[in-house]
Interface confidence: medium
């Protein structure tokens, strides 16, 4: 995350780390015990093997993501449709081996309702414990940063994104730049709060460079996704 | 959930199992037409800010809130299940109807042991003029950003 | 005000096991983890490890792994050491303390009031 | 794990001097702009008191004459002007990775 702030504890309790090899690679988002919504691109092969990844909830420091606090992934879904080209439908679901304990740190998200309304520069939030610059290195702690969505019309003009973004992605960030999500925070959360509760609008998923000006954050529109992802919870079930 | 799959038309539905597409009016209809059976297991949903329950109807060919009348909890639980949730039922609650909805699902008590939908009938009316806001998981509180002081 | 009050002082015969408590007062126990660190008289402090209330997941420094087991009762807000096997090198004052969990900046605002413990036949 | 290493052992300092305690760490404890060095005083019979955390944060209640600076594995304790009351055992803290570790302690003595 670039140009946030560090995360206090049980701020956001649906942020999980994914590591590969006691690596952090990617984010994700709790929404039940047992699943996490993550990015497409973060599961491509060969990582679309379970075995790979272990998540890490409610711990805000990479340092203290040791073995034996992770939970092992059973199940990796990537969305049918995902084309690794454009990004477009860039949404993967993870099964855990073990459900999560909730608690003050650990909690789920909501998934969107259908009906929800979103205001065009609607306040949300990003976090991740990716790069805090462009090029830059993993971020030992969670950050996380307001960003205003920002309307596809808008984010698809020709000194923007030039026609890129699909109805199955939302652009978020400021058009001067200085605020955005950045590589590693990839598969994590773009949350807002509605009715006093806080809700996954997004997942992030691409954007060229990170927090330049007219190049705001890409995201996953979860609003498209929510009935893909209850069929998947439903069939597993 | 807008039940327009890429390979049909604005009027069809698509059956995930096969991407075959399948008429509006047969979808929850108690009758599986595709072959997964996901016409039949896609019949609730939760709509809005509020966690609205609806259902769909096959007759209307659209999606109406359940009324409050005769609802509890075991009912809540079967829609949470029907959902994709397991085990993790939260709370079900009456909640004033603001949407001028004219046209409701109201619950046929008399039925017999079947999904939950099936239990359900076409109403234009709803005696508590109240209507279902389920939640199927505790979601979306985080611990206030204000910390106690030291 | 945050408090940490600990169990008082304990004579106990080699290869018993001891039990220390440390009540937790004056703020939410389940947002914050307690840590336990020993002090043998005269020396420095070594970290035994954790324990988060919110969850009750626990880390223990290696070195403790077998010898100190850390529980929490919410209900009453209490965290708990137990000392097993005891031995004339476990005679140190054991102290609670309390830390940020996850942002774990890992430093001690709040400390308990200590309890010595004697092994001695 | 990071080993700490404190100097000077013990040091006498007059009143009113300046007392400066190094703490040295066996690898960096600094990274995503933190440096994860706490300080602590401790005097007989009491438990450790927090003075400085993340190598130059001054808790709350702790008197200014107290300060800390440092990052990467060099980290200073200052206190200055020196006051009776600060007759103690200082101890340094890292927090980078598990387990945490504290550094031997130096005593602070009054001439």
């Known amino acids: 995350i670039v140009g946030g702030e560090s995360a206090l504890p049980g701020a956001w309790p649906w942020q999980v780390s994914l590591h590969v090899q006691n690596v952090h690679v990617c984010g994700g988002s709790i929404i039940t015990p047992e699943w996490i919504v993550t990015a497409a691109h973060c599961v491509e092969k060969p990582l679309n093997n379970p075995w790979h990844w272990t998540a890490f909830a409610g711990i805000l420091r990479q340092s203290f993501m040791f073995y034996g606090a992770g939970y092992q992934v059973e199940k990796v879904i990537s969305h049918p449709n995902y084309d690794s080209k454009t990004k477009n439908n860039d949404i993967a679901l993870m099964k855990l081996q073990k459900p999560l304990t909730f608690n003050d740190l650990v909690k789920p998200v909501c998934l969107p309702n259908p009906g929800m309304m979103l205001q065009p520069e609607q306040l949300c939030w990003i976090s991740g414990w990716g790069a805090t610059e462009e090029k830059g290195k993993t971020s030992e702690v969670l950050n996380a940063a307001k960003v205003l969505l920002i309307e596809t019309q808008r984010c698809n003009s020709r000194y923007v994104y030039d026609n890129l973004i699909t109805p199955a992605m939302i652009c978020a960030g400021f058009l001067q730049g200085n605020v955005d999500s950045c590589q590693g925070d990839s598969g994590g959360p773009l949350v807002t709060s509605k009715n006093n509760i806080w809700w996954l609008i997004g997942d992030t998923s691409w954007g060229s460079g990170c927090a330049k000006a007219y190049r705001p954050g890409v995201y996953g529109n979860v609003m498209v996704f929510t009935d893909w992802i209850y069929r998947q919870m439903r069939a597993d079930g | 959930w807008k039940f327009m799959g890429s390979k049909c038309s604005n009027s069809g539905i698509e059956c995930d199992s096969s991407g075959t597409c399948i008429n509006p009016s047969n979808w929850c209809d108690g009758v599986s037409h595709c072959p997964g059976g996901e016409d039949e297991n896609r019949c609730v949903r939760l709509y809005g800010p509020n966690f609205i329950l609806q259902v769909y109807s096959s007759q209307r060919k659209s999606w109406h809130p359940v009324c409050q009348d005769d609802w509890s909890e075991g009912y809540g639980r079967a829609a949470c299940q029907d959902m994709g949730y397991r085990n993790s039922f939260y709370s079900s609650q009456g909640i004033v109807d603001d949407s001028g909805s004219t046209s409701f699902m109201k619950l046929n008590t008399s039925a017999g042991n079947v999904d939950i939908y099936k239990k359900l009938y076409h109403s234009d009316a709803c005696s508590s003029k109240a209507v279902v806001s389920l939640r199927c998981i505790a979601c979306g509180v985080n611990l206030n950003s204000s910390r106690q002081s030291r | 005000q945050v408090q940490l009050q600990q169990s008082g002082p304990a004579l106990v015969k080699p290869g018993a096991s001891l039990k220390i408590s440390c009540e937790a007062s004056?703020?939410?126990?389940?947002?914050?983890?307690i840590n336990w660190v020993k002090q043998r008289p005269g020396q420095g402090l070594e970290w035994i490890g954790w324990?988060?209330?919110?969850?009750?997941?626990?880390y223990y420094n290696e070195k403790f792994k077998g010898k100190a087991t850390l529980t929490i009762d919410k209900s009453s807000s209490t965290a708990y050491m137990l000392l097993s096997s005891l031995t004339s090198e476990d005679s140190a004052v054991y102290f609670c303390?309390?830390?940020?969990?996850?942002?774990?900046?890992?430093?001690?605002?709040?400390w308990g009031t200590g309890t010595t413990v004697t092994v001695s036949s | 794990d990071i080993v700490l290493t404190q100097s000077p052992a013990s040091l006498a300092v007059s009143l009113g001097q300046r007392a400066t305690i190094s703490c040295r760490a066996s690898?960096?404890?600094?990274?995503?702009?933190?440096?994860?060095m706490h300080w602590y005083q401790q005097k007989p019979g009491q438990p450790p008191k927090l003075l400085i955390y993340?190598?130059?944060n001054l808790e709350s209640g702790v008197p200014a004459r107290f300060s800390g600076s440092g990052s990467g594995t060099d980290f200073t304790l200052n206190i200055h002007p020196v006051e009776e009351e600060d007759a103690a055992t200082y101890y340094c803290?890292?927090?980078?990775?598990?387990?945490?570790?504290f550094g031997a302690g130096t005593k602070l003595e009054l001439k």
């Open positions: 993340l190598a130059s």
């Open positions: 803290q890292h927090s980078r990775d598990l387990p945490l570790t």
């Open positions: 004056g703020y939410t126990f389940t947002y914050y983890s």
């Open positions: 303390a309390r830390s940020d969990y996850g942002s774990a900046y890992g430093y001690f605002d709040v």
């Open positions: 690898k960096s404890v600094s990274t995503s702009g933190y440096s994860y």
């Open positions: 324990i988060f209330p919110g969850s009750g997941s626990t």
